[in-house]
């Protein structure tokens, strides 16, 4: 039971990827505003998103402090232009989201092949190391420096003639491949945490290929 | 509990065509690479090619290149080998195997295998 | 393509004895080899990873290490179970590729 008219939130979805995280919910309010309360599991309740008519509320600065932490958060329902009235329990409506652990279940966001660069019959692949949310002493932390090693990324390479896809694998954010002399290949990347079980992957990157501005060739 | 299941294997002619299925369960493919490997009749383990069931990416190995092709329904949660143009040397015990994805950790768990034999 | 080259073919060894097989890559893998054992009529089962590290539920008598391109596994005591078909493999690059097997008999 809760205030008169007013209808507690459903469906409450975290959506993150690379940790800018968000709350979504619904329904669109008809008559009604929403707040959202965050919390670790340990700690105090935090408002944000005060009475608003949004249907999500961007937590990105909570979830930040501490990746690793499991977050709660709740979403309160109130009359528009009475937000003082609380339901018949003698509190707003509100509903809670699912736990949320940002460093286990936040989605891995596309990468970006940087460069490659051919000496020989050797290629030299780098994956742009992506600048996240979350910050440390005053400056933003990579993804890699996030994960560490966690993060693995999948190199799938492959010749411009031909379909096959190989494989190597980094944990750090170069390749070194062997080529056959002579040929063009293409590239792309595929972030990965191996030891998770839901959002291993990432999107792939978007294919790059030799003979393209990108690229660096030189013949020893 | 993380399980692989191969099933259609059987008796085929020479020239003649097969599927086999690797149904999953306790994981989903699509978070984990699916590898074909072979073995014939007393013989060793030959790999035969893998999918990524998340973008459909394969590779084959050069005796089945041409023949064979790796598939994948995510929404069954089963990766398929469609083997054509059978000759006798394909006769073997055809396994799935799930690919962790990690630099250590290759082939982490198998089925238990399906017999093809190609024979007139 | 890689090939890993795997001896003995076979062998004979006793309950208790020490069993040393080895496996040769023809260029470098780094640790990226993996170690299978399987017995008739059944599937490969993963014994060691990367290199030298113990795959669960494996028993410690099985170990194995690496020197550059040789790769061995080692059981330290041989037990009634152990006696199959051991398998390198490496999986450093597309195609991975397997060594020829070892087969260990009861002598």
């Known amino acids: 039971s809760g205030t008169t008219n007013t209808v507690a939130a459903y469906n409450l979805t975290w959506k993150s990827t690379n940790f800018k995280t968000i709350l979504e919910w619904e329904p669109k309010p008809v008559n009604q505003v929403y707040t959202v309360q965050i919390s670790t599991k340990s700690g105090d309740w935090k408002s944000k998103c005060f009475y608003t008519t949004d249907t999500e509320c961007d937590l990105t600065d909570e979830i930040v402090k501490d990746v690793k932490q499991t977050y709660l958060a709740r979403v309160f329902s109130y009359p528009a232009g009475n937000v003082e009235s609380t339901g018949s329990a003698g509190e707003p409506l509100y509903e809670n989201s699912p736990e949320f652990t940002p460093y286990l279940e936040t989605n891995l966001g596309q990468p970006t092949i940087q460069s490659f660069e051919q000496v020989g019959t050797k290629v030299n692949v780098t994956v742009e190391d992506e600048r996240t949310l979350v910050r440390r002493n005053n400056t933003f932390l990579s993804l890699r420096d996030v994960f560490g090693k966690d993060l693995i990324y999948t190199l799938y390479y492959w010749k411009s003639s031909s379909s096959g896809k190989k494989t190597a694998k980094t944990n750090t954010n170069e390749f070194l491949i062997d080529v056959d002399k002579g040929e063009n290949y293409c590239f792309s990347v595929q972030a990965v945490i191996p030891s998770r079980t839901v959002n291993r992957k990432s999107t792939d990157s978007p294919v790059e290929c030799m003979g393209q501005e990108k690229g660096e060739f030189r013949e020893i | 509990e993380v399980q692989l299941v191969e099933s259609g294997g059987g008796l085929v002619q020479p020239g003649g065509s097969l599927r086999l299925s690797c149904a999953a369960s306790?994981?989903?493919?699509?978070?984990?690479?699916i590898h074909w490997v072979r073995q014939a009749p007393g013989k060793g383990l030959e790999w035969v090619g893998y999918?990524?069931?998340?973008?459909?990416?394969?590779y084959y190995a050069d005796s089945v290149k041409g023949r064979f092709t790796i598939s994948a329904d995510t929404s069954k949660n089963t990766a398929y080998l469609q083997m054509n143009s059978l000759r006798a040397e394909d006769t073997a015990v055809y396994y799935c195997?799930?690919?962790?994805?990690?630099?250590?950790?290759?082939?982490?768990?198998w089925g238990q295998g399906t017999l093809v034999t190609v024979s007139s | 393509d890689i090939q890993m080259t795997q001896s003995p073919s076979s062998l004979s060894a006793s309950v208790g004895d020490r069993v040393t097989i080895t496996c040769r890559a023809s260029?470098?893998?780094?640790?990226?080899v993996a170690w299978y054992q399987q017995k008739p009529g059944k599937a490969p089962k993963l014994l060691i990873y990367?290199?030298?590290f113990l795959y669960s539920g494996v028993p410690s008598r099985f170990s194995g290490s690496r020197s550059g391109t040789d790769f061995t596994l080692t059981i330290s005591s041989l037990q009634p179970e152990d006696f199959a078909t051991y398998y390198c493999?490496?999986?450093?690059?597309?195609?991975?590729?397997f060594g020829q097997g070892t087969k260990v008999e009861i002598k």
């Open positions: 195997a799930r690919d962790y994805g990690s630099l250590q950790v290759q082939l982490d768990y």
């Open positions: 306790g994981f989903t493919i699509s978070q984990y690479w």
């Open positions: 999918i990524d069931p998340y973008n459909g990416y394969t």
């Open positions: 260029q470098d893998v780094n640790t990226a």
């Open positions: 990367s290199a030298s």
């Open positions: 493999q490496q999986h450093y690059t597309t195609p991975p590729t």
